[in-house]
Interface confidence: low
């Protein structure tokens, strides 16, 4: 907390300009009017304030706007945005794409910070849905931003926006997020032919159900192991050895190297050892010969 002290004679700021960089922290507190700062925020970014001085300026804005800054101030925060906490940002109501772009520019080249994640969260909630313009803007700054959104937030993405998503945008998505995105992608790409469809849908397959994987296995898609390893375990488990062999095509040999990793390891444990042996890969851990294989999904439905 900066101590309240009277502004020295002749030091009262008439405007936000370079002379303020020579002010001590207590002088900034005493001599800069918060309302003046708010109306001239666009100048702050052009002045080489120290981080300590920026702390004082932030403190003044916090006092002026205890309920959260107006968008007119937010749009011109510049480097002061880096001083904001997620708690500060949760008080904002950001609706302009230009405001969002201005703040993302400040953080450009860095990892997505908690502040940026919160900002995007506030923006999407304000907009009501993640439209294509927003999606294009955000993917330009953060390839992985989609995966920072909750499944609930992703549900607001219209299928038409899926065309803006690139494979690298989905790298860090978890299965719950892909569960939401996959049906949208399926809808978006439904009119494409087989091979083109697979190229587009491939990145989203971590959300695909068993029946869709079975269908793909009949289309000679030759799924690579990297894609297979990202599939939902529960979707892979019901696939037969023959179906996995068709799905992977020449990549089936890669199962050996991944036999201890999900979903391969869990799939192996649910297959008959006799069936696994037909692959000739030396996969071990299948159900011993003579053991009854229960259909677990049927068992659960009956219980």
């Amino acid at each position: 907390e900066v101590e309240k002290t009277a502004c020295p004679s002749g030091k009262k700021a008439r405007e936000i300009d370079e002379s303020l960089i020579f002010y001590k922290k207590w002088e900034l507190e005493a001599c800069v009017d918060a309302a003046l700062l708010a109306t001239q925020m666009d100048r702050v970014n052009a002045i080489p304030f120290t981080y300590e001085q920026l702390d004082v300026l932030k403190h003044k804005l916090d006092e002026l706007y205890p309920q959260g800054y107006p968008e007119s101030v937010i749009q011109h925060l510049g480097y002061l945005f880096l001083k904001m906490s997620p708690e500060d940002i949760r008080k904002w109501n950001v609706t302009s794409l230009e405001t969002l772009k201005a703040l993302l520019e400040v953080n450009k080249g860095h990892e997505m910070s908690p502040q940026v994640a919160t900002l995007i969260d506030r923006f999407v909630k304000g907009r009501g849905q993640l439209d294509k313009d927003t999606l294009d803007t955000l993917t330009a700054f953060y390839p992985g931003y989609l995966c920072s959104l909750s499944p609930e937030e992703l549900s607001s993405v219209p299928p038409s926006s899926i065309w803006a998503v690139r494979p690298q945008d989905l790298d860090t998505c978890d299965p719950r997020q892909l569960d939401v995105l996959y049906p949208k992608a399926r809808l978006a790409f439904q009119n494409m032919n087989g091979s083109e469809y697979f190229v587009k849908i491939q990145s989203f397959l971590g959300g695909a159900p068993t029946e869709d994987l079975k269908a793909l296995s009949q289309q000679n898609v030759s799924m690579d192991l990297a894609t297979f390893m990202k599939l939902r375990t529960d979707a892979v488990l019901p696939l037969t050895v023959a179906e996995v062999q068709k799905l992977l095509g020449p990549h089936v040999e890669g199962l050996k190297a991944e036999e201890r990793h999900r979903p391969v390891r869990d799939w192996i444990l649910r297959q008959r050892q006799d069936d696994l042996d037909t692959l000739g890969l030396g996969l071990q851990g299948g159900i011993p010969n003579g053991y009854l294989v229960l259909d677990l999904s049927m068992q659960e439905a009956l219980s």
């Epitope: 201890r260 390891r265 869990d266 071990q284 851990g285 011993p288 053991y291």
Partner: antibody, heavy 117, light 110 residues
Framework: EVHLVESGGGLAQPGGSLRLSCAAS????????MAWVRQAPGKGLEWVAN????????YYVDSVKGRFTISRDNAKNSLSLQMNSLRAEDTAVYYC??????????WGQGTLVTVSS | QSALTQPPSASGSPGQSVTISCTGT?????????VSWYQQHPGKAPKLIIY???RRPSGVPDRFSGSKSANTASLTVSGLQAVDEADYYC??????????FGGGTKLTVL
């Protein structure tokens, strides 16, 4: 004949470190998953960690994550367990073992680690 | 507290059969067929006697057999002999590359 010989056990202070080593022979070490299993005095067995054939993946029981590191040198047929920030509850006989699909088929004779001040 | 539950002790007379149970959940024993059993004599390292629920490694007598029903695995030792007196541990794959062990059962040959 298969041999797994552990070394490096002994007395350590709480918060201290120890490095266990295991020399393997008599089987194809480089094509085997390897593991460390421990047994506290008078208690049951507890899996500690395992490591993939080429060393690219390692897995740990929750209680040692961030403190223990399993590693291997296939050129020397050796397995190691670096134990940092040791606690009294880490006191146990540590067995070097071969992990065949979540079964331990080969065991060493074990090395005793005592954590006490 | 062990992840898999075994009775602390079991006993039988020479020539008899004894069964040791190992209870888990649908996430370990019930979910996979990677149950193993180990025999450990005092002061010795454990020895694998059953893997893959019911498979015996070479050299293990056929007096030892394994089975599984739902979330419980069982080890049966028939034709009990004095040399069978030892601690027995079950293990199961528990998901996420974890190997879970039972607390152990002390088998006494009366």
């Amino acid at each position: 004949e298969v041999h797994l010989v552990e070394s490096g056990g002994g007395l350590a202070q709480p918060g201290g470190s120890l490095r266990l080593s295991c020399a393997a022979s008599g089987f194809s070490f480089s094509s085997s998953w390897m593991a460390w299993v421990r047994q506290a005095p008078g208690k049951g067995l507890e899996w500690v960690a395992n490591i993939k054939q080429d060393g690219s993946s390692q897995y740990y029981v929750d209680s040692v994550k961030g403190r223990f590191t399993i590693s291997r040198d296939n050129a020397k047929n050796s397995l190691s367990l670096q134990m940092n920030s040791l606690r009294a509850e880490d006191t146990a006989v540590y067995y070097c073992a071969r992990d065949i699909w979540y079964s331990i088929d080969y065991w060493g004779q074990g090395t005793l680690v005592t954590v006490s001040s | 507290q062990s992840a898999l539950t075994q009775p602390p002790s079991a006993s039988g007379s020479p020539g008899q059969s004894v069964t040791i149970s190992c209870t888990g959940t649908s996430s370990d024993i019930g979910g996979y067929n990677s149950v193993s059993w180990y025999q450990q004599h005092p002061g010795k390292a454990p020895k694998l006697i059953i893997y893959g629920v019911s498979r015996r490694p070479s050299g293990v007598p056929d007096r030892f057999s394994g089975s599984k029903s739902a979330n419980t695995a069982s080890l049966t030792v028939s034709g009990l002999q004095a040399v069978d007196e030892a601690d027995y541990y079950c293990s199961s794959y528990g998901g996420s590359n974890n190997l879970l062990f039972g607390g152990g059962t002390k088998l006494t040959v009366l």
